[in-house]
Amino acid sequence: GSGIFQLRLQEFVNQRGMLANGQSCEPGCRTFFRICLKHFQATFSEGPCTFGNVSTPVLGTNSFVVRDKNSGSGRNPLQLPFNFTWPGTFSLNIQAWHTPGDDLRPETSPGNSLISQIIIQGSLAVGKIWRTDEQNDTLTRLSYSYRVICSDNYYGESCSRLCKKRDDHFGHYECQPDGSLSCLPGWTGKYCDQPICLSGCHEQNGYCSKPDECICRPGWQGRLCNECIPHNGCRHGTCSIPWQCACDEGWGGLFCDQDLNYCTHHSPCKNGSTCSNSGPKGYTCTCLPGYTGEHCELGLSKCASNPCRNGGSCKDQENSYHCLCPPGYYGQHCEHSTLTCADSPCFNGGSCRERNQGSSYACECPPNFTGSNCEKKVDRCTSNPCANGGQCQNRGPSRTCRCRPGFTGTHCELHISDCARSPCAHGGTCHDLENGPVCTCPAGFSGRRCEVRITHDACASGPCFNGATCYTGLSPNNFVCNCPYGFVGSRCEFPVGLPPSFPWVA
């Protein structure tokens, strides 16, 4: 603790100019004071002034009023500082002395004589209020007041509480009268060292190092740190949690970088071809007759559509073609015959019927044969009747479609939902794809059916095939294989033309 006992001398009266021994001062009592402050004693005794002592210069002669003086010699009130916890009790001895010597340093003069002394014993609380008193004896009267106040930065009933106002890294506060801290605006905490963040700043996602600030933790953004940041590789997606990549409408793939509406956005197919949003590049062009190429940009030979009938040979010309007909045929496409039924033109048991008064004929073919002369065996699979990759097989007069897994129906046109039987374990999400069901596994599980629990760095073993990139950190304990074009599967192990970069999670 630290404080100051202050004594204000107000008036001293010694009308007769007498000393304590009854003698008179000549020419008058040139008066100075000695003050001794010590711990409380029921009976005041000589001995050290344990709380401090002080002397004044000569303040006047015989009777005088003592003016307040704040500096230099003769300072009033008198200051008795102490460096301990104020006990609340004290003993005070005030002695008035006459000196024949130096006004300013009368203590040092020989021949000083006691005029009078007073002793005060009692209790005194720390406070700003002065306690006023007056002591009389037969010859003198002393008016005075006193108090105990705390030194700068000390507070409390005993001046034992240290508080120094500050505004720096260690705290931002002022001191209350009792020494408790009063935080400056924008600061809080026991030592006022915690800033009060911007109102509404998210408690978990945000923090601050100074008032009214809101600094976001990794993965969060915005004024209040309540908006997430999408994954670093994300292209056309958003997030609801940090580092997610939820695709915008019309985009797909692990990083939302595949245009699901490529046909609409880019019109890649030329020469009147049909564009569909599928295939390894995100689109496929179906060309009109006479065109080829990835974008149907290449014109085919005019003969490519085999326009010449009845065995005629085709020759390309600048903007057209020419059919060279075999013997017995004529016309632009060798479609007219010079033969008649007499020439037995119908093969494979076909029946000949004369037309145009016998100048031409038509063949009626038996089952399984076709062509103008019944020369072709019917291939019932030429029209590609089997959908969804089914295999067409000729069976005598009919044909059947052998369907791929997941499809049924006469033409394999019906899709069987493999997900109906819930093949994915541990809460995996099932996707019906051409090759059968595929499971997207939750965090911590892998395998084609999410049956394997992961307990290690999933990418460490290099699980992805065919040049696929392995990712961890998208969700705990899982890896994701981002497949190159032309490969699918949880590890990109299957070379199948499924939609690219489906997020296969192992």
Partner: antibody, heavy 118, light 107 residues
Amino acid sequence: EVQLVESGGGLVQPGGSLRLSCAASGFTFSNFPMAWVRQAPGKGLEWVATISSSDGTTYYRDSVKGRFTISRDNAKNSLYLQMNSLRAEDTAVYYCARGYYNSPFAYWGQGTLVTVSS
Amino acid sequence: DIQMTQSPSSLSASVGDRVTITCRASEDIYSNLAWYQQKPGKAPKLLIFDTNNLADGVPSRFSGSGSGTDFTLTISSLQPEDFATYYCQQYNNYPPTFGQGTKLEIK
């Protein structure tokens, strides 16, 4: 393909102003926070400013606060840096980058040189 | 601000060598660290984020490790195109700060 193309750099006197632009393509610009990062000749990289995608909140390094302003126009897929009261120590190649102050800078532009000299 | 210190500031190596670059943070940044590669006259390119995650299209010969204050970038078998300057960056604390760079030169 993600592309960031800066423009607007050049020679300017101390105390002068310059406005840098960054044209973004290949990603949904409005979904992502953006930043400016600079590199003084022969020196390392230094983050300058960031703007959020959600509400346009801005942050600046202390040495440019009050002098530089980062802004964005989502309709034009563009990021801007208005630089006022330029100083010699602002001389650098300024890169437009996709990222925030608390995330990696995933994509960068080719940079534009700003020279502050009398 | 967090100080990021890279070492060495430069190093010479040959094609096929295994190379390690270290980065030390002045305080804990957890795993919020990225590595960038920069070639002369070009923009930096993100190699690794979150200490050990490879950015899209980055060859698997690059790897990262560490946590807290000490981190490493390793190139398992140097290729001719790997000679460049490498920077680490922390994004755990505001403001983000970069290391001073490590120049990888051909021996």
